[in-house]
């Protein structure tokens, strides 16, 4: 086994790294010079009172993923400057308040993944007045939240509780914290969800529920006594839900008067989209929800899925919708027409094709839509895509990147207000008049272009990296250009005259090209001090490709001999 000392390296700023080794104890000889100590992923099982005694200037201590099962009472007594303490994923089965008492500067504390049943007999965190981020709990043994657990904490930026196997929640336990910007709650079962919800509704701004089985969730009226909910965003992550329980969840969300954003990530819908409310249930009011995000929704019985028409009436006020990687192949025309306030629609990584897009973007569909993202779908014709979107009179931004268009016709029709078009990674090998003249931003990066000779009088930003261009575009065709990103092409040189011809250019990124380091090129690039302000990736990404004896060196460092520069 390697010696403990050999596994630790410290730089001159006192940043010490010793992670992913075979350390079985904290290295001896640590001094006040140490500011940050990372000993994660080792085999430390024990921390003694003397291990960190001299580390009075320590600001960060990371001990995640060791086998620590014992910390002596005064182990942290000299760590008054400590701001970041990570003890996650160890074997601490009993937490002691004496560890944390001296840590008056602590802003981050992670205790996740340790096998304690409760957060101890006394209030662990009452002395931690500067604490901003707290992570507690574990997935199998943490079964009880007590009223004293969070006493003394008034404000937290983030609170993560892994209560996967929670069996007991003492009412008002979480109510003692006056404000939590983001609460992340891991719960396998929903049994105690409503009790917790009642306590956090007036103190949490963003509530995130993870790993919960809501298949049998039933909403029963809350005894809140108050309706002034602070929750602005509710996220469901890796949650299971059914048609019926989704309706119950919506009733719960109804209690949140100021809810603006709703997010479902990696969720499973064990249903067919039959959301018809039973007669005795009052109609759900979506309230002020403006943003709906759904990512990687899994619907096992996808082939039986309904058209969601029962929910159409709830969508009229929504302004932003993202449904990503969820096998969407159609947004029915009627739904599109109901989405009257929709300004932003992201359908990335789905199954949209032109024929169905035509139905989705029917007459009067998405009347307020400004941004449409159809990245990585199954679109194949630029001409048809542009034509299909003509109904969207307010559309200004279109992202159809990562669709395989291959070719581009000579002419296309596009919505008349178009300002932004993303055609990156679409396998196109030429650009034509199909690209609208109204554009201000064009992204054609990662394609097979070897020429760019389009006249785009209003274009301000051109992204054309990872292509096969051999020269900079003609500046006269792009009179308004402010930003040009053309890295990783086949450009061998550019001149002062070329750059000066871009009268309005503020930013150029041209690194990663195969520069011929001629005397002219070197003198121009090395003498122009102002160049560094324009070239945002200078000097690191500007390397010589030839002459061969300077290949791989940075352009700014290369010096050619007098004889090489004065050959006749």
């Amino acid at each position: 086994e390697s010696s403990n000392q050999a596994s630790l390296s410290c730089d001159r700023n006192g940043i010490c790294k010793g992670s992913s080794g075979s350390l079985n104890s904290i290295p001896s000889g640590l001094t006040e010079a140490v500011k940050s100590l990372d000993l994660s992923n080792n085999r430390i099982t024990y921390i003694s009172n003397s291990d960190l005694q001299r580390c009075v200037n320590l600001q960060a201590l990371v001990l995640t993923s060791n086998g620590i099962n014992t910390i002596e009472e005064d182990s942290f007594s000299s760590l008054g400057s400590l701001e970041h303490l990570d003890l996650s994923y160890n074997y601490l089965s009993n937490l002691s308040s004496s560890w944390f008492k001296p840590l008056s500067s602590l802003t981050f504390l992670n205790l996740l993944g340790n096998p304690y049943k409760t957060l101890g007999e006394t209030s662990l965190f009452s002395h931690l007045t500067k604490l901003q981020i707290l992570r507690v709990g574990n997935m199998d043994t943490f079964t009880k939240i007590q009223r004293k657990d969070f006493a003394g904490l008034t404000f937290l930026e983030e609170l993560e509780i892994d209560a996967s196997d929670l069996q007991s929640y003492e009412p008002k336990s979480l109510k003692s914290i006056q404000n939590v910007s983001h609460l992340i709650l891991h719960m396998k079962q929903h049994i105690l969800l409503l009790e917790i919800f009642v306590d956090v509704t007036s103190s949490v701004e963003c509530l995130e529920l993870r790993d919960t089985d809501l298949d049998t969730f039933h909403f029963s009226e809350l005894s809140t006594g108050e309706t002034n909910s602070l929750i602005k965003k509710f996220t469901f992550r890796n949650v299971k839900i059914t048609d019926e329980s989704l309706f119950q969840v919506m009733k719960l969300l109804n209690q949140i008067s100021g809810l603006l954003e709703l997010e479902f990530d990696d969720c499973t819908l064990n249903g067919v989209g039959n959301f018809r409310a039973s007669d005795n249930d009052r109609v759900i009011d979506p309230g002020k929800v403006e943003t709906l995000t759904i990512r990687r929704l899994h619907i096992p019985r996808f082939y039986l899925f309904y058209d969601l028409s029962t929910l159409y009436s709830l969508t009229e006020r929504v302004k932003r919708i993202t449904v990503e990687n969820s096998k969407v192949f159609l947004v029915p025309c009627l739904l599109s027409q109901h989405l009257k306030s929709l300004e932003y629609l992201d359908l990335s990584e789905n199954l949209m094709v032109e024929e169905y897009l035509k139905n989705s973007a029917c007459e009067d569909a998405w009347p307020s839509l400004q941004t449409l993202i159809l990245r990585q779908n199954h679109l194949a014709s630029l001409e048809k895509t542009g034509e299909t979107l003509l109904t969207l009179k307010n559309l200004t931004n279109i992202d159809i990147s990562k669709n395989s268009f291959h070719s581009m016709p000579e002419t296309c029709q596009w919505p008349e207000k178009m300002k932004y078009l993303n055609l990156s990674s679409t396998r196109i090998h030429s650009v034509t008049g199909c690209i609208p003249k109204t554009l201000e931003i064009l992204d054609v990066s990662n394609n097979n272009l070897n020429l760019f000779s389009l006249n785009l009088p209003q274009l301000k930003e051109l992204y054309i990296s990872r292509n096969k261009l051999m020269t900079l575009p003609d500046a006269s065709l792009l009179p308004m250009l402010l930003v040009l990103k053309i890295s990783r092409n086949a450009i061998t040189t550019f001149s002062k005259e070329q750059l000066d011809s871009f009268h309005t250019l503020k930013t150029l990124e041209a690194g990663g090209n195969n520069f011929i380091c001629s005397c002219e090129f070197l003198s121009f690039t090395q003498e122009q001090q102002a160049l560094a302000k324009v070239l945002i990736d200078w000097p690191a990404n500007y390397l010589c490709d030839s002459p061969s004896h300077v290949r791989g060196q940075q352009v700014q460092d290369v010096r050619l001999s007098v004889s090489e520069c004065h050959r006749t």
Epitope: N41, T45, G67, N69, T70, Y89, N90, M139, D140
Partner: antibody, heavy 120, light 112 residues
Framework: EVQLVESGGGLVQPGGSLRLSCAAS????????MSWVRQAPGKGLEWVAA????????NYADSVKGRFTISRDNSKNTLYLQMNSLRAEDTAVYYC?????????????WGQGTLVTVSS | DVQMTQSPSSLSASVGDRVTITCRSS???????????LNWFQQKPGKAPKRLIY???NRDSGVPSRFSGSGSGTDFTLTISSLQPEDFATYYC?????????FGQGTKVEIK
């Protein structure tokens, strides 16, 4: 040098009980989680039960839950497996195995095993 | 429970051969701490298993460098770059990311 020595195996009738012991030496026993792993004759390895170094948190395979109890005596550096209501399918070589000192660092040292035969 | 499936179940090889054993898990073995808990063990007849590799690719001390582990998520590989006479044994993969801990069914490496 780390050593784990199992004992207590033998022939027992179905429904009977047996208590296995594992004497540990060469390391600070109380600092490490320990497990029992078994291997039926001619078959593969099957994890049976685990116990953490301190605090007594235990975990069991479904096949033995409610019948077997893992425990430890840190003062004696000994791990135990109390086996009740034994069945023919519990016949196996039982190994005690030590965790390596890291998190979920299974299993850096094993004993030589003790054979348990359940037969009438 | 997480199922661990090894292939092949057995193989015949000669000294000096490059041997590859694969192990596939029914769920991802990436734990919430970011680590992937997949170990490889070697067992010779009548002996206790011996750990060769922990956390996918880390060799235990004393294990020859001809043994290497690789993979991520649900697909893992143990490679013996040049088989030696003492390497003829049964090899097991084991996942430590989820309770209960589970082993593959084993791969027996025999002399051709």
């Amino acid at each position: 040098e780390v050593q784990l020595v199992e004992s207590g195996g033998g022939l027992v009738q179905p429904g009977g009980s047996l208590r296995l012991s594992c004497a540990a030496s060469g390391f600070t026993f109380s600092n490490y989680a320990m497990s029992w792993v078994r291997q039926a004759p001619g078959k593969g390895l099957e994890w049976v039960a685990a116990i953490y170094g301190r605090g007594g948190y235990t975990n069991y395979a479904d096949s033995v839950k409610g019948r077997f109890t893992i425990s430890r005596d840190n003062s004696k550096n000994t791990l135990y497996l109390q086996m009740n209501s034994l069945r023919a399918e519990d016949t196996a070589v039982y190994y005690c195995a030590k965790e390596g000192g890291g998190y979920r660092d299974y299993f850096d040292y094993w004993g030589q095993g003790t054979l348990v035969t359940v037969s009438s | 429970d997480v199922q661990m499936t090894q292939s092949p179940s057995s193989l015949s090889a000669s000294v000096g051969d490059r041997v590859t054993i694969t192990c596939r898990s029914s769920q991802s073995l990436v734990f919430s701490d970011g680590n992937t808990y997949l170990n490889w063990f070697q067992q010779k007849p009548g002996k206790a298993p011996k750990r060769l590799i922990y956390k996918v690719s880390n060799r235990d001390s004393g294990v020859p460098s001809r043994f290497s582990g690789s993979g991520s998520g649900t697909d893992f590989t143990l490679t013996i770059s040049s088989l030696q006479p003492e390497d003829f044994a049964t090899y097991y993969c084991m996942q430590g990311a989820h309770w209960p801990l589970t082993f593959g069914q084993g791969t027996k490496v025999e002399i051709k």
